[in-house]
Interface confidence: medium
């Protein structure tokens, strides 16, 4: 890759408000590669991190015996980070296809940025309570990885066959849906 295309990092993160802020719907959207893109009349030469999304998750915590009294709210970092000129027709363009080439040496990923530790109380069936310290995500960021980072995790976790497809939009959807699945 040329430096002009990949070396500039802007910290623009898309933050959609999910339609259904319940645990399952937001998590499924994150895991199945649901996309929200911001195309807000930016200058055509502006480079942004397209698609890194902070999804709000609401879930109950259980250790197998006890369950949290109130739901835990946290962020799920989802989507891809794509530093490229924001153009109305960027999906499917030659640049994008080249960028998502399986052999690309540098890729960007939407990852956890900030976390905080909080105590959460669990109610047990016998009437007792337990307190746990857990880490929750509070912000997301785009981070540059080498291809090896991406391939290593895909190697370990992936469920669906990893064959690349020509249309990069489909390919990214396939890889996102397998990200949190089993081999």
């Amino acid at each position: 890759f040329k430096n002009d295309a990949t070396e500039i990092l802007y910290s623009h993160v898309v933050k959609p408000v999910p339609a259904h802020p319940s645990s399952n719907s937001t998590l499924n959207q994150a895991r199945n590669g649901g996309r929200h893109f911001s195309n807000t009349g930016l200058d055509r030469n502006t480079r942004v991190q397209v698609g890194c999304r902070e999804l709000r998750s609401t879930k109950y915590i259980s250790d197998g015996q006890c369950t949290s009294i109130s739901p835990l709210k946290e962020l799920v970092c989802a989507g891809e980070c794509l530093p490229l000129p924001v153009l109305p027709n960027w999906i499917g363009g030659g640049y994008g296809t080249k960028y998502w080439s399986r052999r690309s040496s540098q890729e960007w990923r939407c990852v956890n940025d900030k976390t905080r530790t909080q105590r959460i109380q669990l109610q047990c069936q016998d009437g007792s309570t337990r307190t746990y310290k857990i880490t929750v995500v509070t912000a997301c960021k785009c981070k540059r990885y080498t291809r090896q980072h991406n391939e290593s995790s895909h190697n370990f976790e992936s469920m669906s066959p990893a064959k690349p497809v020509q249309h990069h939009r489909e390919r990214k959807r396939a890889s996102k849906s397998s990200k949190h699945s089993m081999s």
Epitope: Q148, H149, S153, N155, S158, K163
Partner: antibody, heavy 113, light 107 residues
Framework: DVQLQESGPGLVKPSQSLSLTCSVT?????????WNWIRQFPGNKLEWMGC???????NYNPSLKNRISITRDTSKNQFFLKLNSVTTEDTATYYC??????WGQGTTLTVSS | DIQMTQSPSSLSASLGERVSLTCRAS??????LSWLQQKPDGNIKRLIY???TLDSGVPKRFSGSRSGSDYSLTISRLESEDFADYYC?????????FGGGTKLEIK
């Protein structure tokens, strides 16, 4: 049901090459996934050696880079580990695995004269 | 390479007890950590991946969590089949690297 089965000579002399085979049933190695070799030394330390992907590309552990080769025979649905110039330090149980979830049962290899 | 420091190296516990094993990563691994169980016959089974996601068929008494660079495997109530060796594995980048293992024995 997907299964992986390692096979090999059991005993190799120092300075020779070792060759192991992982036979895969129930899934084509060209259809997807990455296919790994991992070994476990006496004393139970585990080491990832390398992998071959569904499209035939490789990644190797840098500690073995000059000695290791992972190849495949798609017609037999097998992939192979070749390790050159072995020493007694290569005595271990060798596992093949599909991704991180499906592991073979392991084959023990001893390097001794 | 990323070093994985696992503790304790051995642990004696009783049936029904709650136990926790810990792994610390020498570099950021962004939650790309798995826990493996190895039975005395040598068979290796993945229990957890992505730090806290339980594999299909793994009993709910197993759970994984993360606090910074520390990752934990907790077994809420030990059963006889849980006495085995446990390894953490980071797969954030190649080469994958393993913790030194924890031998979980019956007290």
């Amino acid at each position: 049901d997907v299964q992986l089965q390692e096979s090999g000579p059991g005993l190799v002399k120092p300075s020779q090459s070792l060759s192991l085979t992982c036979s895969v049933t129930g899934y084509s190695i060209t259809s997807g996934y990455y296919w790994n070799w991992i070994r476990q030394f006496p004393g139970n330390k585990l080491e990832w050696m390398g992998c071959i992907s569904y499209d035939g590309s490789n990644n190797y552990n840098p500690s073995l880079k000059n000695r290791i080769s992972i190849t495949r025979d798609t017609s037999k649905n097998q992939f192979f580990l070749k390790l050159n110039s072995v020493t007694t330090e290569d005595t271990a149980t060798y596992y093949c695995a599909r991704g991180g979830l499906l592991w073979g049962q392991g084959t023990t290899l001893t390097v001794s004269s | 390479d990323i070093q994985m420091t696992q503790s304790p190296s051995s642990l004696s516990a009783s049936l029904g007890e709650r136990v926790s094993l810990t792994c610390r990563a020498s570099q950021e691994i962004s939650g790309y950590l798995s826990w493996l169980q190895q039975k005395p016959d040598g068979n290796i089974k993945r229990l957890i991946y992505a730090a806290s996601t339980l594999d299909s068929g793994v009993p709910k008494r197993f759970s994984g969590s993360r606090s910074g660079s520390d990752y934990s495997l907790t077994i809420s109530r030990l059963e006889s089949e849980d006495f085995a060796d446990y390894y953490c594995l980071q797969y954030a980048s190649y080469p994958w690297t393993f913790g030194g293992g924890t031998k979980l024995e019956i007290k």
